[in-house]
């Protein structure tokens, strides 16, 4: 049976086997087409989600679709039901928390009272000014908290207590990529991890340990990527994996926060990378132990220079490393998080590509997660 499962796939009605390599090849080899059913699926970028959260104390903003203008939500008459609606619009199913935070004098957007219409937040027509003088600070999910804070050093062995959202994504029990837990159902990783194997069956996720071989595997229900853009072949290197059963959170299994839409990280901002990837370029071996390293944001202009990536780094990517080189992500770290700590940990990047590992002029290139928030929310909403 093991041999059969490894090399063949069973079609139904009539029952017969087809070679496993014919799974997800774009051809319907089973009469009912089930060989093309459990495959990596692409999902379009979709419409603008009309709510978003700002890095200014996670304050809620609402889009006026008529004008295309964004407004900050005033706390006046804001309810739990409105908080749930806002979070559902972003695809969250968990119970949100919210509180009032004072409007600051540097508040840029206009402030409006919020109401609900057809399960979407709307600006209340002809409401008064914001009497409370407060905005809505909204958290759709408790995230980004770990039991242990890492020390700021070069490269060192990591503990799952520091990075409880880190997962190993494995094909046929072999570690292929890293990933991050976003909520009980979803793991964030890189799309290029699935280029070779587009069938969902043999992909597994392992969470809750910093040792590669030592933790139970979780079944995957769906793998979703963005439609390929031939104009920018390296763009859209992002994937969401839906788990068959929701995770139970613990000290060693927790979600990381998505970044805020306006999370603009300036050059030299300290960030962290983690992974089980190769310890040397073009060789060495996969690390059995999770490794962590502190890096920093590298200016895109510098990253696109003639002695570096020569314009290949787009606005949907970011660069990170250390200016003198030597600390970088490598093969096998792909899909893992590039992390920033404010009040919580945020996944600001996904390990994507680079030339070599740890070169001074060619730092790691990461998918900029904030550029894909809309896509993530649309995927989640479609799967609610």
């Amino acid at each position: 049976k093991v041999i059969l499962d490894k090399y063949y796939f069973l079609c139904g009605q009539p029952l017969h086997f087809i070679p496993r390599k014919q799974l997800c090849d774009g051809e319907l080899d089973c009469p009912l087409g089930e060989d093309e059913e459990h495959c990596v699926k692409s999902f379009p970028e979709g419409p603008a989600v009309a709510v978003r959260l700002s890095k200014d104390r996670s304050t809620l903003q609402v889009l006026d679709s008529a004008t295309g203008n964004w407004f900050s939500a005033c706390f006046d008459n804001f309810t739990e039901a409105l908080a749930e609606t806002a979070c559902r619009q972003m695809g969250y199913s968990s119970k949100p928390t919210f509180r009032a935070v004072e409007i600051g004098p540097d508040q840029d957007l206009d402030v409006v009272e919020i109401t609900e219409n057809s399960q979407e937040l709307r600006m209340r027509n002809s409401s008064g000014p914001c009497l409370s003088g407060s905005l809505v600070s909204l958290h759709c999910l408790a995230c980004g908290k770990s039991l242990k804070t890492p020390r700021v050093v070069g490269v060192e062995e990591a503990s799952v207590d520091s990075w409880p959202w880190q997962v190993s994504i494995q094909y046929d029990k072999q570690h292929v990529c890293g990933g991050s837990i976003l909520d009980p159902h979803w793991v964030l990783t890189a799309a290029h991890c699935f280029r070779k194997h587009t069938d969902v069956f043999n992909w597994k996720v392992r969470a809750g340990s910093d040792k590669l071989g030592s933790f139970p595997s979780l079944a995957v229900a769906k793998i979703i990527i963005i439609e390929f853009n031939p104009m920018y072949p390296k763009d859209n290197d992002i994937a969401l994996m839906k788990l068959q059963f929701p995770l139970t959170f613990s000290g060693t299994v927790r979600p990381i926060c998505l970044p805020f839409f306006d999370e603009e990280l300036t050059p030299a901002t300290p960030l962290w990378i983690i992974g089980w990837g190769f310890t040397k370029q073009n060789g060495g071996k996969m690390s059995d132990i999770l490794l962590q390293a502190s890096v920093q944001v590298i200016d895109s202009t510098r990253c696109n220079a003639d002695d570096a990536y020569q314009g290949e780094v787009t606005e949907k990517m970011m660069c990170a490393g250390i200016p003198e080189g030597g600390v970088d992500t490598c093969q096998g770290d792909s899909g893992g998080p590039l992390m920033y700590q404010s009040d919580q940990w945020h996944v600001v990047g996904i390990v994507s590509w680079g030339y070599g590992c740890g070169g001074p002029s060619t730092p790691g290139v990461y998918t900029k997660v904030s550029a894909y928030l809309n896509w993530i929310y649309n995927v989640w909403k479609a799967e609610l």
């Epitope: 005033c74 409007i103 409401s127 008064g128 000014p129």
Partner: antibody, heavy 121, light 107 residues
Framework: QVQLVQSGAEVKKPGASVKVSCKAS????????MQWVRQAPGQGLEWMGW????????GYAQKFQGRVTMTRDTSTSTVYMELSSLRSEDTAVYYC??????????????WGQGTLVTVSS | DIQMTQSPSSLSASVGDRVTITCRAS??????LAWYQQKPGKAPKLLIY???SLQSGVPSRFSGSGSGTDFTLTISSLQPEDFATYYC?????????FGPGTKVDIK
Amino acid sequence: QVQLVQSGAEVKKPGASVKVSCKASGYTFTSYYMQWVRQAPGQGLEWMGWMNPNSGNTGYAQKFQGRVTMTRDTSTSTVYMELSSLRSEDTAVYYCARVRIGWLQSPPLYWGQGTLVTVSS
Amino acid sequence: DIQMTQSPSSLSASVGDRVTITCRASQGISNYLAWYQQKPGKAPKLLIYAASSLQSGVPSRFSGSGSGTDFTLTISSLQPEDFATYYCQQSYSIPFTFGPGTKVDIK
């Protein structure tokens, strides 16, 4: 675009009252606080008070308490500032001003053209 | 009431000069401070809010800084249209008081 158009110049006798109007257009009238500021000839700006056009609530600087009344008419999107017991030192240009965002402590961004009130016997 | 003072009360400068005006509050007002420009016979115009945020449409030669009690308005390179009177205003507590103004005229 946002516009605040004020009533014309007034000449009043000491002890009389004056009522200055300010008609708003180009935005949702009830969503923004309105403030009143005055400026005596050759002098600086003096803040008088605020009004919430939605509720009609007001707040006045202590100096004007008991003499000033701010009202509004939502049907015409107009706010009014009435100053009573006029004295010669009330001679000034009176401005209505709408706050930048819908929050009281936001500074005024849009201003009326000003109304000159002259108090003279 | 919070008292606002400005210095200098007037200054003479030439086109291209860097001009700095200071504003002091009698007690801490965080960054609840705005700067206005007023020309004779005209209503004031908002330049800066929240001590350092440039109002949309205002030239970038204007900048503001400070927090607490001491604030500064800087015009990096004075232009002919900048000759006017400048006022600071606090909106930290009612009444929202103005400074006495600084008149900038041509040297």
